[in-house]
């Protein structure tokens, strides 16, 4: 089987959601889990991580053969200590397969605007907390 | 045993919002998809959307996306429904039911006995 | 969205008659269809799952069949209690949609 796990990020508002977007199989999804860590080159480990999230095992209709689990971590309003690397990773309790989706950093500026980058669907996205737009 | 108790009858205004909620009792609510259904006096059944609690991932029909918000609490194994802006067309029976696990099951296997919402002036 | 037309709307049988009840997907649905039943006053039951999958407790007089776009769910000799009203939904792509129903009502 073939499961795909990309990182993305939205904002609402003063929000910042780090999303992580996990492509698998029906049958694929028993067992495996995808986490959020944060500065853990090494060590990523769903015990270590900012939050899991059990994979989808319905897609809730009949006539599809992929499912899309995602989670969602939430940062109500981006401080200095958020700044930091970031990556999406998926593992399987049964098979111990594992897999590492791309970094990603939050760079929090002086002016009290935040960047993140590393982004593979938008290479580099620039947040400003007094206008809440991206730019 | 699997259970899905709704919040009792409502009686709102035209322009108002109702929220019912549906508890769940006798499973793993968040491996699930809940589906919410109504039935208006003499009709049949129409489906509203429905939300996987697992990750809040939730599916609506185009008729009721904007004014329908369907969410759950995992730590209470509680999905809720609301509707905003409410119009008598909206007077009927709202309805959660649990989609059992696809191949599987698939269908609806379980439902709430019904919250009845009036929406009159 | 896949539409959903069950026929006829209204079944006039007597106990112990066969009732066959008629289900049509506006584009093919696999085996992606269930059907219920729904009584007065209560909410609806799953009869069957998958177009002809029996569901436990369910009387074995109780049927479906059918695949792609026409579906059939039959009652072998009706019950008394069978009068009722039944739909059949589908699950195979958003939006989920129901029939319309087919009343069983006694002759």
């Known amino acids: 089987g073939c499961i795909n796990i990309t990182s993305s990020a939205s904002q609402e508002g003063t929000r910042l959601n780090l999303i992580c977007t996990v492509w698998h199989k029906k049958e694929e999804a028993e067992g495996f889990v995808v986490f959020l860590c944060k500065d853990r080159s090494g060590d990523c480990s769903p015990e270590t991580s900012l939050k899991q999230l059990r994979l989808k095992r319905d897609p809730g209709i009949d006539g599809v053969g992929e499912i899309s689990s995602q989670l969602m971590f939430t940062i109500s309003q981006v401080t200095p200590l958020h700044s930091g690397t970031y990556q999406c990773c998926a593992r399987s309790q049964k098979s111990g397969i594992r897999l590492q989706g791309h970094f990603f950093s939050i760079l929090f500026t002086e002016t009290g605007n935040y960047t993140v980058t590393g982004l593979k669907q938008r290479q580099h996205l620039e947040f400003s907390h007094n206008e809440g737009t991206l730019s | 045993q699997v259970q899905l108790v709704q919040s009792g009858a409502e009686v709102k205004k035209p322009g108002a919002s109702v929220k019912v909620s549906c508890k769940a009792s006798?499973?793993?609510?968040?491996?699930?998809?809940m589906q919410w259904i109504r039935q208006a006096p003499g009709q049949g059944l129409e489906w509203i959307g429905a939300i996987y609690p697992g990750d809040d991932d939730a599916r609506y029909t185009q008729k009721f996306r904007g004014r329908a918000t369907l969410t759950a609490d995992k730590s209470t194994s509680t999905a809720y429904m609301e509707l905003s802006s409410l119009r008598s067309e909206d007077t009927a029976v709202y309805y959660c039911?649990?989609?059992?696990?696809?191949?599987?099951?698939?269908?609806?296997?379980?439902w709430g006995q019904g919250t009845t919402l009036t929406v009159s002036s | 969205e896949i539409v959903l037309t069950q026929s006829p709307a209204t079944l006039s049988l007597s106990p112990g008659e066969r009732a066959t009840l008629s289900c049509r997907a506006s584009?093919?649905?696999?085996?992606?269809l269930h059907w219920y039943q729904q009584k007065p006053g209560q909410a609806p039951r799953l009869l069957i799952k998958y177009a002809s999958q029996s569901i436990s407790g369910i009387p074995a007089r109780f049927s479906g069949s059918g695949s792609g776009t026409d579906f059939t769910l039959t009652i072998s000799s009706l019950e008394p209690e069978d009068f009722a009203v039944y739909f059949c939904?589908?699950?195979?792509?958003?939006?989920?949609?129901f029939g319309g129903g087919t009343k069983v009502e006694i002759k």
């Open positions: 039911a649990r989609r059992g696990i696809a191949a599987v099951v698939g269908g609806f296997d379980y």
């Open positions: 006798g499973y793993t609510f968040s491996d699930y998809w």
């Open positions: 584009q093919s649905i696999s085996n992606h």
């Open positions: 939904q589908q699950s195979n792509s958003w939006p989920l949609t």
